[in-house]
Interface confidence: medium
Amino acid sequence: SERCDDWGLDTMRQIQVFEDEPARIKCPLFEHFLKFNYSTAHSAGLTLIWYWTRQDRDLEEPINFRLPENRISKEKDVLWFRPTLLNDTGNYTCMLRNTTYCSKVAFPLEVVQKDSCFNSPMKLPVHKLYIEYGIQRITCPNVDGYFPSSVKPTITWYMGCYKIQNFNNVIPEGMNLSFLIAFISNNGNYTCVVTYPENGRTFHLTRTLTVKVVGSPKNAVPPVIHSPNDHVVYEKEPGEELLIPCTVYFSFLMDSRNEVWWTIDGKKPDDIPIDVTINESISHSRTEDETRTQILSIKKVTSEDLKRSYVCHARSAKGEVAKAATVKQKVPAPRYTVELACGFGAT
């Protein structure tokens, strides 16, 4: 056959769908690879062809669109399963072609089983809610296009295995689940089950997402440097190891980049001709506030190093702060026989 622009296997679009539920999968060509949409392609005389490779097989085969009740069908640039079966798992290819043009892309489709509590190997999207921040909502995801607006589905929400019917601060509002005030106890997996009729049959769509309650922007503060501070003096003798921790607390801020760095005499440690290492550790609170610690280490400090200025810097979307460490050369303890004797006038 003639040459075809092959975009390969698009593993970025690892599509997972539940067994025995409808699934509508758009050909990724128009979404991510080509600069025109399906309508333009269709009106230009291009044809969209679907085929697949079963799991653990190498053989490409056409998709059977003549199954009972049109279980698999194609509509424009969408491949429909009504519903899916476990053995639909495989790599699917959509190819756009005419006599002079050809472009194709493959993508993996995994049909996943779930248990009665909605547990499954499905990768779950995470929705972050601010703690104690007034009314916030999550919306049942990826249900657009499954039924026309004239159809009124029934939506049931679950937290874990339990139907949400005992409203503490969580209220089902159709496709939305409203959190009047979000608390740590609202962390968990939330599932919406959308039930709708189609051609005398009843279909269910199950969508699960993870809710993570995070620090509220109204409580957010600029970075706080806990160490170094004014109460600790780093007194060392030449030849000893110098260890200075820079410990910074960052309030959770959505999409904020938290940064911690040291300067030595106003320069980055890499720009100073001394043997310095910096080790970083990060910990998070239950509401995703972050504590970063960067330990500056000089194995064998010199008297020159003990005269330098060591400053810890921190930056977030809330602001930038800096704190200098107090570093001193340890004054050797006086030796009684010589120094003190001299002091008393001995010869």
């Epitope: 339990y162 005992n166 503490n168 601060n169 209220i171 009047l180 106890s185």
Partner: antibody, heavy 118, light 110 residues
Framework: EVQVVESGGGLVKPGGSLRLSCAAS????????MSWVRQAPGKGLEWVGR??????????DYAAPVKGRFTISRDDSKNTLYLQMNSLKTEDTAVYYC?????????WGQGALVTVSS | QSVLTQPPSASGTPGQRVTISCSGN????????VNWFQQLPGTAPKLLIY???QRPSGVPDRFSGSKSGTSASLAISGLQSEDEADYYC???????????FGGGTKLTVL
Amino acid sequence: EVQVVESGGGLVKPGGSLRLSCAASGFIFSKAWMSWVRQAPGKGLEWVGRIKSKTDGGTTDYAAPVKGRFTISRDDSKNTLYLQMNSLKTEDTAVYYCTTGGYVFDYWGQGALVTVSS
Amino acid sequence: QSVLTQPPSASGTPGQRVTISCSGNNSNIGSYIVNWFQQLPGTAPKLLIYSKNQRPSGVPDRFSGSKSGTSASLAISGLQSEDEADYYCAAWDDSLNGVVFGGGTKLTVL
């Protein structure tokens, strides 16, 4: 099926004490916020107070007329909510309802009648 | 005197549409969701409408709620004799740090 059943109502003298219990079933009681609402004879509904789940701090809020005299507590191991009423006044005479939720009261018990009279 | 204000009574004939109002302020209805309860004679109250216009399962769609600013209303269309009951609105109140109820509206089906 969600059920809440109040018990412990009765006749008590002014200044006396009484403890109401509310047995809950059919939902995860430990995760639920619970409230008490009362209704004086021939009058409207009046919120008494609520208790949050332990995971949300287990804290309580009370209506001004009962603050300092009434205490709401819970025993998650027994799926039971309590209302301890001290220094009772004649105006506390009412049917006391136990309800699920802290904002939206979706399930109600049948109520326990408390009569404060000398 | 209740924090939320409701008319003490309302009436209508079978099949009619009746509306019950509930008036509050910025610290309750203006800021929080409104709930409506129905109390049939001699029974415990029952949740009818919550959060603007959501109905628990089993509540007919003849009942609907709406909210505008610091006021809310409950509408009952296609009035039936079994709708004869007391209706209460409720909302959380920030300034009082508690739930406040309306005084209740007695609905009579003529």
